[in-house]
Interface confidence: medium
């Protein structure tokens, strides 16, 4: 038979992967059974889905089950499912090439996980390469499969190469797949019924199909008495002194009780899904076990919610927040489908790849949704367009946000925000209808505390009596933000300033018109106003009048074409000056982000606009440099030294305000000239 089979080589990457699985999981061999059961369940899901729109799909075999049988004599373990089965072509492709197994990504993740010292056993399930874990315990794996569209075939491999042949026995399965493991000598424990039953119970708890193990049990049965035994009894009765009435004679037993070993299929799992049970009856440990089982994660979830939604659509759902963000959460954000939400209709698994079950920003949430109100006998494409899915999505988002809101403050700030803070910020940008709810979940660093993060609610609670705006300062780091000249006076006056240090932060705040009735004010832009008394207003106006010659000289002469206007600053206390963006110009931080993202490509209006966008130059009238400049300008407004000083101050302010200098060489030359002057060295001396 083997001579007639067609031989194949495994793809090189599959070989690499098998070695990796065997080397990294040799201490955790038992997971092979979890993977085989999981694959069987997937195959059953597929045929059940097909049967909804094809009435003949189950004709080959009406039952939907997984059956596991140990054969101690022959050293074999069989796992049989009545799932969709595989055609000859699929046996070759799915079990021998990279096409199906997601191998390259798996290899990368597996290597990363090993380097990070993380558990690798969950990864094989996540990447659909679990089948190969069979080689942890088997010298040889034989796959017999019957698909509705093909004859029955046998795939066989010793992990070095594989062969495929048409099954000479014909169709013995009806439909489905049997995986037969020829066990390694040291894996004979997996032929012990108790071992197998315990493992099956452990790994089949949340599989929604009946899983049976071929089991023996001792039963007491009544057997008819054999002839010699009957004769013996009659003899004993004849010796009896008392006569026995005829009717009593009828009652005499013609059978005996015998203990016998009976073999039958024993059901291993309670197939009522956990989400169908009332939440009051489900223990926390059960939720954790279910999460690990269905998500193929090794950690407990950070939070979960189990609910029944009623109204326009009725459905049951359990949603989970993982303890840590999946790797590559923002790789191809929005274009990569998330398969974390599994959709069931009337307990039938439909799909886990509907794009719109959750918005992109909640792409980390895992869970199940089971509805009786969606149609079963339609194509997935039709179902994806069903109007009730939008209602379900809306409720899932609300419930997810409820679940997140209920995470205890300490856990939220220390764990959730670190892992998923960016998702919440993207939610504020993307989800208009839930923006207010999401805004309450935002956390930022602020001047209130050197390390703790704050919510906007807490900020508003601490706002000063007449403060009507939420102040924020953006920078590439907290250090940069808190040492900015723009926050000097605010901090001195006891105002709290929020520090935005992530690239997405400023986008996020721009998407929030207000919070709790308070608008946001970027302190690096125009519009920062302080509540002032009549006396301080008079004092400010007098200062403005005093510095008018300097302000006009800067605008019209020294910094002509560089600034929009020069004004006396209300926000500076230490720094001599600062450069302030217009209301909707780029702040220094935004300019840095935009340039990093290479927005300025080609000759578009942004190049023209930002090249020509002049900023407001604010001066600190109390600073000795500024006071001295005023004196010098009054004396001689054509003084070359004071002209140079004005430009150096402008350029320094540009840098301190977070902007980039277009001409750093000229800046360096000017600084050198100023140094020469201060040290009385001839500016021309070589």
């Amino acid at each position: 038979l083997r001579e007639k089979s067609e031989k194949f080589a495994f793809q090189a990457e599959v070989n690499r992967m098998m070695k990796l699985i065997i080397n990294s999981l040799y201490k955790n061999k038992e997971i092979f059974l979890r993977e085989l059961i999981s694959n069987a369940s997937d195959a059953l899901d597929k045929i059940r889905l097909i049967s909804l729109t094809d009435e003949n799909a189950l004709a080959g075999n009406e039952e939907l089950t997984v059956k596991i049988k140990c054969d101690r004599e022959k050293n074999l373990l069989h796992v049989t499912d009545t799932g969709v089965g595989m055609t000859r072509e699929e046996l070759v492709k799915n079990l021998g090439t990279i096409a199906k197994s997601g191998t390259s990504e798996f290899l990368n993740k597996m290597t990363e996980a090993q380097e990070d010292g993380q558990s690798t056993s969950e990864l094989i399930g996540q990447f659909g390469v679990g089948f190969y874990s069979a080689f942890l315990v088997a010298d040889k794996v034989i796959v017999t499969s019957k698909h509705n569209n093909d004859t029955q075939h046998i795939w066989e491999s010793d992990s070095n190469e594989f062969s495929v042949i048409a099954d000479p026995r014909g169709n013995t399965l009806g439909r489905g797949t049997t995986i037969t493991l020829v066990l390694k000598e040291e894996a004979s424990d997996y032929l012990e019924l108790d071992t197998i039953k315990n493992l099956v119970r452990k790994y089949s708890q949340f599989i929604n199909f009946p899983i049976y193990v071929w089991s023996s049990k001792t039963e007491t049965v009544e057997e008819p008495l054999e002839e010699d035994e009957t004769a013996q009894e009659e003899k004993e009765e004849a010796d009896d002194e008392a006569a026995v009435e005829e009717e009593e004679e009828e009652k005499k037993p013609k059978t005996k009780k015998v203990e016998k070993t009976v073999w039958d299929w024993e059901l291993m799992n309670d197939i009522k899904p956990i989400w169908q049970r009332p939440s009051k009856e489900v223990e926390e440990d059960e939720y954790k076990a279910f999460y690990k089982s269905f998500s193929k994660e090794s950690d407990d979830p950070m939070a979960y919610i189990h609910f029944t939604a009623e109204g326009e659509v009725t459905f049951k759902s359990i949603l989970f927040v993982p303890t840590s963000a999946p790797r590559g959460l923002f790789d191809e954000y929005g274009s990569k489908k998330s398969d974390y939400i599994k959709l069931y209709v009337r307990r039938v698994f439909i799909t886990d790849d509907f794009h719109d079950m959750m918005p992109k920003y909640l792409n980390f949430v895992k869970g199940v949704v089971d509805s009786d109100d969606l149609p079963l006998n339609v194509s997935r494409e039709t179902l994806q367009q069903h109007k009730l899915l939008k209602v379900i999505r809306k409720k899932l988002v609300r419930k997810t946000l409820d679940m997140i809101k209920k995470i205890a403050d300490e856990k939220y700030n220390d764990t959730f925000w670190k892992e998923f803070g960016t998702n919440i910020k993207l939610g504020v940008i993307e989800d208009h209808s839930n923006r207010t709810r999401l805004a309450k979940l935002l956390r930022f660093q602020s001047s209130h505390h050197s390390t703790d993060i704050t919510s906007l609610d807490q900020y508003v609670e601490r706002m000063k009596e007449k403060q009507d705006k939420i102040y924020f300062m953006a920078g590439s780091s907290r250090k940069e933000a808190e040492s900015s000249p723009f926050v000097e006076r605010l901090l001195k006056k006891g105002y709290e300033v929020i520090y935005l240090t992530e690239p997405v932060d400023e986008y996020c705040i721009q998407a929030l018109p207000e919070f709790d009735g308070k608008r946001f004010q970027n302190v690096a832009k125009e519009g920062v106003k302080f509540d002032e008394s009549e006396k301080s207003k008079e004092s400010r106006e007098a200062t403005e009048k005093e510095f008018e010659p300097l302000l006009n000289w800067m605008k019209d002469k020294a910094l002509k074409d560089k600034i929009e206007k020069a004004v006396v600053s209300q926000r500076l206390t230490e720094s001599p000056c600062a450069l302030v963006a217009s209301q909707y110009g780029w702040s220094g931080n935004m300019e840095r982000i935009m340039k990093a993202q290479a927005y300025q490509t080609g000759k578009d209006i942004s190049t023209n606009y930002y090249a020509s966008q002049k900023k407001t130059f604010e001066i600190n009238p109390r600073h000795p440099l500024i006071r001295d400049m005023l004196r010098r300008v009054k004396e001689d407004e054509d003084d070359k030294t004071v002209m140079d000083l004005a430009v150096v101050l402008f350029e320094t302010a540009t840098l301190r305000s977070g902007y980039l200098l277009p001409d750093t060489k000229a800046y360096g030359d000017r600084i050198e000239r100023m140094l020469r002057l201060s040290l009385n060295i001839d500016p021309e001396a070589q």
Epitope: Y333, R435, Q510, T601
Partner: antibody, heavy 121, light 110 residues
Framework: EVQLLESGGGLVQPGGSLRLSCAAS????????MSWVRQAPGKGLEWVSG????????YYADSVKGRFTISRDNSKNTLYLQMNSLRAEDTAVYYC??????????????WGQGTLVTVSS | QSVLTQPPSASGTPGQRVTISCTGS????????VSWYQQLPGTAPKLLIY???HRPSGVPDRFSGSKSGTSASLAISGLRSEDEADYYC???????????FGGGTKLTVL
């Protein structure tokens, strides 16, 4: 030279679907916020939807929310608009437009010539 | 009904100065930049003014924009026959999370 070329318009029945494409050239497509703007016959301009350069974050006008999906393929320099459950009031010329200054939410500096979508039984 | 309000029509004779107004609210014009677009008959719109008052290169300085509070206006001086077109104002609306246009003003050169 910056060019935006829309395609995919045509006649469709109410309730039907259509997918519009906009092929971009002459600039680094992946650096720009892109939008769809429509104009019903004899009427004014109506912004339909916008999409961020890389994150895939999307915005929609209330009139199309839940029915239209904007997407982009930066490797193909193409913007898409998947329109489902079409109504007669969606009949319009659909323009693809480039927005260089998002997130300061500035203007559309380049527009395509438009593609006509007619929804009628 | 457009979020930004423009007069439906305006007219002037060649050489004259014409102003078109655009009124909104604090969530759009009040706190965001205004743009103006010109649409000649049978063509796609063209950007005329951005960031309230800036002209893209190639737009004649006869066109100017200004903004005050929640209103913006477009002024065209030295009117020419080729200026006959529809003019639209536009701005981002932070409450609607959408870009909004005015209803358009048809300018006729008499």
């Amino acid at each position: 030279e910056v060019q935006l070329l829309e395609s995919g318009g045509g006649l469709v029945q109410p309730g039907g679907s259509l997918r519009l494409s906009c092929a971009a050239s002459g600039f680094t497509f992946s650096n720009y916020y892109m939008s769809w703007v429509r104009q019903a016959p004899g009427k004014g301009l109506e912004w339909v939807s916008g999409i961020y350069p890389n994150s895939g974050s999307t915005y929609y006008a209330d009139s199309v929310k839940g029915r239209f999906t904007i997407s982009r393929d930066n490797s193909k320099n193409t913007l898409y608009l998947q329109m489902n459950s079409l109504r007669a009031e969606d009949t319009a010329v659909y323009y693809c437009a480039r927005d260089p200054l998002h997130p300061a939410r500035f203007p559309f500096d380049y527009w395509g010539q438009g593609t006509l979508v007619t929804v009628s039984s | 009904q457009s979020v930004l309000t423009q007069p439906p029509s305006a007219s002037g004779t060649p050489g004259q100065r014409v102003t078109i107004s655009c009124t909104g609210s604090s969530s759009n014009i009040g706190n965001n930049a205004v743009s103006w677009y010109q649409q000649l008959p049978g063509t796609a719109p063209k950007l005329l003014i951005y960031a309230d008052s800036h002209r893209p290169s190639g737009v004649p300085d006869r066109f100017s924009g200004s903004k005050s509070g929640t209103s913006a206006s477009l002024a065209i001086s030295g009117l020419r026959s080729e200026d006959e077109a529809d003019y639209y104002c536009g701005a981002w609306d932070a409450s609607l999370n959408a870009y909004v246009f005015g209803g358009g003003t048809k300018l006729t050169v008499l």
